[in-house]
């Protein structure tokens, strides 16, 4: 018979022969032959392979180094890598999450549009007219100016993006 030029799923071509790939969590020890099956071995502790493969070495689990602000989100297994995230108040500096930085605070005049997560930083937005923020915060949104009218008061001092309006009593008309 003609030697194959392509193999089925979960197989690979070697020496004009289709061999079975090793399943996730196992590495290749020896290719199959005309007489023997592919030989695979389980990955060692703290190692993994996450696909059907012909790798001769397993990959090492990622280390979520607490000194870099990292913690484990999902423990590694023989078939999956460890997933790291950041400690509370910190977020990853990259998609691979190899280190963490402190969440950014929004300065006065800016409010939090989106609170930071373990993988994304705080998103700030300028306070629009009618709103203010007088603190630097990683949580506070822009607050609406106080409505003097609803309190039967009048505006004594206009608000800004950093300060609330100041309300005062209405001037009594003298008789």
């Amino acid at each position: 018979p003609e030697p194959p030029t392509a193999c089925r799923e979960k197989q690979y071509l070697i020496n004009s022969q289709c061999c079975s790939l090793c399943q996730p969590g196992q590495k290749l020890v020896s290719d199959c032959t005309e007489f023997t099956e592919t030989e695979c071995l389980p990955c060692g502790e703290s190692e993994f392979l996450d696909t059907w493969n012909r790798e001769t070495h397993c990959h090492q689990h990622k280390y979520c180094d607490p000194n870099l602000g990292l913690r484990v989100q999902q423990k590694g297994t023989s078939e999956t890598d460890t997933i790291c995230t950041c400690e509370e108040g910190w977020h990853c500096t990259s998609e691979a999450c190899e280190s963490c930085v402190l969440h950014r605070s929004c300065s006065p005049g800016f409010g939090v549009k989106q609170i930071a997560t373990g993988v994304s930083d705080t998103i700030c937005e300028p306070c629009p007219v009618g709103f203010f923020s007088n603190v630097s915060s990683a949580f506070e949104k822009c607050h609406p100016w106080t409505s003097c009218e609803t309190k039967d008061l009048v505006v004594q001092q206009a608000g800004t993006n950093k300060t609330d309006v100041v309300c005062g009593p209405q001037d009594r008309l003298r008789a």
Epitope: S46, K75, G76, T80
Partner: antibody, heavy 119, light 113 residues
């Protein structure tokens, strides 16, 4: 037959130090991750620390971070727990336990060694 | 940290009867990569260290009798002893094996009625 035998427990004053050892036999020690787990008298189980087979990965419970140090010597088939700045709340039976690279669970536990912190 | 909550605290069952205990986790224990739930059950008999009973929610450890079975997924898990034997008197702990810190439930004490 898998065997894990601890030693080093005892009575120590608050603020004192103690070093626990766990001697392994009946399996290839360097192929396994290892844990320390403790159990206060009459209470449940509390995980303390983990060290990977090759010493590369170490994790601690927040309650012991900065005070306890887990280590291993694969040549001596031994696991250690150095405990400093001991507190009354560290009083417990300390178990070493093995973690394999397949189940990723603690599949064998030692008998435990008692640590008592009291003045 | 993942909080593991077991119920009931204790359970008295007649010999040969079924014993069922529950374990709830404060977040999912499902590994997104291999679709296994990393929930482990340990048995601790009086005066003995814990012993691995079940891993990956429902896989019995070698040598564990088939009267022990585990089920559940995500955050809700159950351990069942189909026909209680005298040697099953113990405290049963569920454990989060999904992430660090590893956390245990408070345990369910199984006694003979």
């Amino acid at each position: 037959e898998v065997q894990l035998v601890e030693s080093g427990g005892g009575l120590v004053k608050p603020g004192g130090s103690l070093r626990l050892s766990c001697a392994a036999s009946g399996f290839t020690f360097s192929d396994y991750g290892m844990h320390w787990v403790r159990q206060a008298p009459g209470k449940g189980l509390e995980w303390v620390a983990y060290i990977s087979s090759g010493n590369r990965i170490i994790y601690y419970a927040d309650t012991v971070k900065g005070r306890f140090t887990i280590s291993r010597d694969n040549a001596k088939n031994s696991l250690y727990l150095q405990m400093n700045s001991l507190r009354a709340e560290d009083t417990a039976l300390y178990y070493c336990a093995r973690q394999d690279g397949y189940r990723y669970a603690m599949d064998y536990w030692a008998q435990g060694t008692l640590v008592t912190v009291s003045s | 940290d993942i909080v593991m909550t077991q119920s009931p605290d204790s359970l008295a069952v007649s010999l040969g009867e079924r014993a069922t205990m529950s374990c709830k986790s404060s977040q999912s224990l499902l590994n997104s990569g291999n679709q296994k739930n990393y929930l482990t059950w340990h048995q601790q008999k009086p005066g003995q260290p814990p012993k691995l009973l079940i891993y990956w929610t429902s896989t019995r450890e070698s040598g564990v009798p088939d009267r022990f079975s585990g089920s559940g997924s995500g955050t809700d898990f159950t351990l069942t002893i189909s026909s209680l034997q005298a040697e099953d008197v113990a405290v049963y702990y569920c454990q989060n094996d999904y992430t660090y810190p590893l956390t245990f439930g408070g345990g369910t004490k199984v006694e003979i009625k």
